[in-house]
């Protein structure tokens, strides 16, 4: 196949994917904040979105994907599907995905979703900065 295995993409292609993800993530977060005003960020949810074993940091797609699969029925499915599609391209092929359960309480659930979206946006910003600060 012409395409390199998805977990073997060079920094240039990773950067392309991050550039696609940024407006999707930003738009999803802004829409959710408008729709769910007054919902606080949860201090019980931590999205481990960066790998600790690579320099510069790599987006830990396998850790992020389960969260987006979990919140998909409760958010903008169309945008979430686009985000999942991009994250799949960055996933190491044989990395297992953990099962994530969304809080049953409505308010806690909204707080959980908001936290995921906020942390993901911050994470993309961090990875993008690291890709731009390389020896360019």
């Amino acid at each position: 196949s012409h395409m390199a295995p998805t977990h073997q993409l060079p920094p240039s292609d990773v950067r392309k994917i991050i550039l696609e993800l940024q407006p999707l993530s930003r738009g999803l977060l802004e829409d959710y904040q408008k729709k769910e005003t007054g919902v606080p960020e949860s201090n019980r949810t931590l999205l481990l979105c960066l790998t600790s074993d690579s320099q510069p940091p790599r987006l830990n797609s396998s850790a992020i994907l389960p969260y987006f699969r979990a919140i998909r029925p409760l958010s903008d499915k169309n945008i979430i599907d686009k985000i999942i599609e991009q994250l799949d391209k960055l996933k190491f092929q044989h990395e297992p995905e953990t099962e994530i359960s969304v809080p049953a309480d409505t308010f806690e659930c909204k707080s959980f979703i908001l936290t995921i979206l906020q942390q993901f946006s911050a994470c993309l910003e961090s990875v993008f900065k690291s890709l731009n600060s390389g020896p360019q």
């Epitope: 012409h2 390199a4 993409l9 240039s12 950067r15 550039l19 020896p135």
Partner: antibody, heavy 118, light 111 residues
Framework: EVQLQESGPSLVKPSQTLSLTCSVT????????WNWIRKFPGNKLEYMGY???????DYNPSLKSRISITRDTSKNQYYLQLNSVTTEDTATYYC????????????WGQGTSVTVSS | DIVLTQSPASLAVSLGQRATISCRAS??????????MHWYQQKSGQSPKLLIY???NLESGIPARFGGSGSRTDFTLTIDPVEADDVATYYC?????????FGGGTKLEIK
């Protein structure tokens, strides 16, 4: 078969804007990445930037303040605008497709020669 | 930016002989065992044509006389045997890091 065709003025005056069109047939610009590359008279090739399937753009930092790539999906065309041109922008301009991650630019237009001169 | 240095700048080879073109990158263009270096052929008055992608993969429709090898910073394009139709300028290009960059080109002539 995928075909790309550049068009636009062959002569541009210094300080003006260079505007080129790339017309694509045999593939949709709503998939893949669509690039501009130029070749200077001394044969040096320079990568300029791209517009993606979703409309995201990214440019060579050496041109960032002067370049803009846009598209019209209904016409299956994408465009290059280069502002404040100088004689140093005299080159043959190519459009090319980058179809798959981890691959290379597999289809190129035939190129259009642009001279910047008063 | 990653600088690609091609050598020689020009090359004259007899028909049926082997042509070898070198491309050296200022830093590694490898990730997880893949080399993001590609080779193009540009004939006079034509656009560049992809020959080899990811260092050693022959593009569809390209004759097996063309071959690519190398990894990290050192890459080679080989044409064996050279035919009259191979007269052109050959360029290497890296897609490892932004901005993508090209080598200065090697002009192949027939002796």
């Amino acid at each position: 078969e995928v075909q790309l065709q550049e068009s636009g003025p062959s002569l541009v005056k210094p300080s003006q804007t260079l505007s080129l069109t790339c017309s694509v047939t045999g593939d949709s610009i709503t998939s893949g990445y669509w690039n501009w590359i130029r070749k200077f008279p001394g044969n040096k090739l320079e990568y300029m930037g791209y517009i993606s399937y979703s409309g995201i753009t990214d440019y060579n930092p050496s041109l960032k303040s002067r370049i803009s790539i846009t598209r019209d999906t209904s016409k299956n065309q994408y465009y290059l605008q280069l502002n404040s041109v100088t004689t140093e922008d005299t080159a043959t301009y190519y459009c090319a497709r980058y179809g798959n991650y981890g691959y290379a630019m597999d289809y190129w237009g035939q190129g259009t020669s642009v001279t910047v001169s008063s | 930016d990653i600088v690609l240095t091609q050598s020689p700048a020009s090359l004259a080879v007899s028909l049926g002989q082997r042509a070898t073109i070198s491309c050296r990158a200022s830093e590694s263009v490898d990730t997880y065992g893949n080399s993001f270096m590609h080779w193009y052929q540009q004939k006079s008055g034509q656009s560049p044509k992809l020959l080899i992608y990811r260092a050693s993969n022959l593009e569809s429709g390209i004759p097996a006389r063309f071959g690519g090898s190398g990894s990290r910073t050192d890459f080679t394009l080989t044409i064996d045997p050279v035919e009259a139709d191979d007269v052109a300028t050959y360029y290497c290009q890296q897609s490892y890091e932004d901005p993508w960059t090209f080598g200065g080109g090697t002009k192949l002539e027939i002796k």
